[in-house]
Interface confidence: medium
Amino acid sequence: LQVTVPDKKKVAMLFQPTVLRCHFSTSSHQPAVVQWKFKSYCQDRMGESLGMSSTRAQSLSKRNLEWDPYLDCLDSRRTVRVVASKQGSTVTLGDFYRGREITIVHDADLQIGKLMWGDSGLYYCIITTPDDLEGKNEDSVELLVLGRTGLLADLLPSFAVEIMPE
């Protein structure tokens, strides 16, 4: 089993649609179960996010340049939700996403009809096959949702978007 998300980072506009792509190949002849999971950014400082002293965390980040303090932390330190699952042709949305225009298309791509304020974060594409357990069964993409901002007004296309005040 091999799962690949081609875009490691995706930027999309608030209240616009987007598609998070996911490809997989498998030796199984059984239908795969596709699940998309959302993980919010790590809200703590890097030391707290791994439950360690800041000195130890800093030495870890120096040794491992791939480690990102805002993406890599224990699930208990951030919000984790199932966005949608697909078995056969049946797509089921997670409780938090019910009522939203979200579906899984082209085998494993997550299609979101209208991006919302809290959609920024990490999205994991997880594939389960009953008789192909070897290989890589998940991959992730970081999604950043941008609204209409003066800072970018003359750098990005201007979309007519709204805001959800705190």
């Epitope: 980072k9 930027v11 608030l14 950014y41 790590c42 809200q43 703590d44 400082r45 990102d68 805002y70 993406l71 304020w117 920024s120 970081e142 950043l144 949702v145 941008l146 609204g147 209409r148 901002t149 003066g150 800072l151 970018l152 007004a153 003359d154 750098l155 007519a160 978007v161 709204e162 805001i163 005040p165």
Partner: antibody, heavy 120, light 112 residues
Framework: QVQLVQSGAEVKKPGSSVKVSCKAS????????ISWVRQAPGQGLEWMGG????????NYAQKFQGRVTITADKSTSTAYMELSSLRSEDTAVYYC?????????????WGQGTLVTVSS | DIVMTQSPLSLPVTPGEPASISCRSS???????????LDWYLQKPGQSPQLLIY???NRASGVPDRFSGSGSGTDFTLKISRVEAEDVGVYYC?????????FGGGTKLEIR
């Protein structure tokens, strides 16, 4: 609670450059914009430019174009503002400010300020 | 560039009394999404500025409800329903519609 900690005061000669750092602790550096604002002695606030670290996109006020460079290092949650060809009128307190995306233009957290004195 | 004009320059107020600061922009700050790209900041003596109001009328987190922002297009007002001693400082309006982001000249609120 997010904190922005800036580097210390600097005294510079006219024609030289200064680089001020702004380190963010707490919160998520990935989902913020950082702006730099300066305040000359007894004067008001002046926006110099800003950056969205996750995109690496910076935007500068025309007044400072060619003299200012704003960068961000996501791995250390630190933003930098470098101002070159300094003149006496650049003497000011330089602030970094953080705005939360998806927007980012309203700055809910500010650094303590860095006084840059340009004098021969 | 959008020019921001504030008045008055100085505002002496008795504690417990209301206060009002006006801000005018050289072009409309109302965007097609229905929001006004106008923020208010307060800089207390010897401190960094702090956000009070964003997008015209939204109070920032932790800001007392005696502060309110109103207005649309080119004319905006910051109101303090009952001024307290801790409210002294310089108040700035700022437009966030387009770059360069620009500030008003500031209004100095002092206690009478």
């Amino acid at each position: 609670q997010v904190q922005l900690v800036q580097s210390g005061a600097e005294v510079k000669k006219p024609g030289s450059s200064v680089k001020v750092s702004c380190k963010a602790s707490g919160g998520t550096f990935s989902s913020y914009a950082i702006s730099w604002v300066r305040q000359a002695p007894g004067q008001g606030l002046e926006w110099m430019g800003g950056i969205i670290p996750i995109l690496g996109i910076a935007n500068y006020a025309q007044k400072f174009q060619g003299r200012v460079t704003i960068t961000a290092d996501k791995s250390t949650s630190t933003a930098y503002m470098e101002l070159s060809s300094l003149r006496s009128e650049d003497t000011a307190v330089y602030y970094c400010a953080r705005g939360r995306l998806p927007y980012g233009d309203f700055w809910d957290s500010w650094g303590q300020g860095t006084l840059v004195t340009v004098s021969s | 560039d959008i020019v921001m004009t504030q008045s008055p320059l100085s505002l002496p107020v008795t504690p417990g009394e209301p206060a009002s600061i006006s801000c005018r922009s050289s072009q409309s700050l109302l965007y097609s999404n229905g929001y006004n790209y106008l923020d208010w900041y307060l800089q207390k003596p010897g401190q960094s500025p702090q956000l009070l109001i964003y997008l015209g009328s939204n109070r920032a987190s932790g800001v007392p409800d005696r502060f309110s922002g109103s207005g649309s297009g080119t004319d905006f007002t910051l109101k303090i329903s009952r001024v307290e001693a801790e409210d002294v400082g310089v108040y700035y309006c700022m437009q966030a519609l387009q770059t360069p982001l620009t500030f008003g000249g500031g209004t100095k609120l002092e206690i009478r």
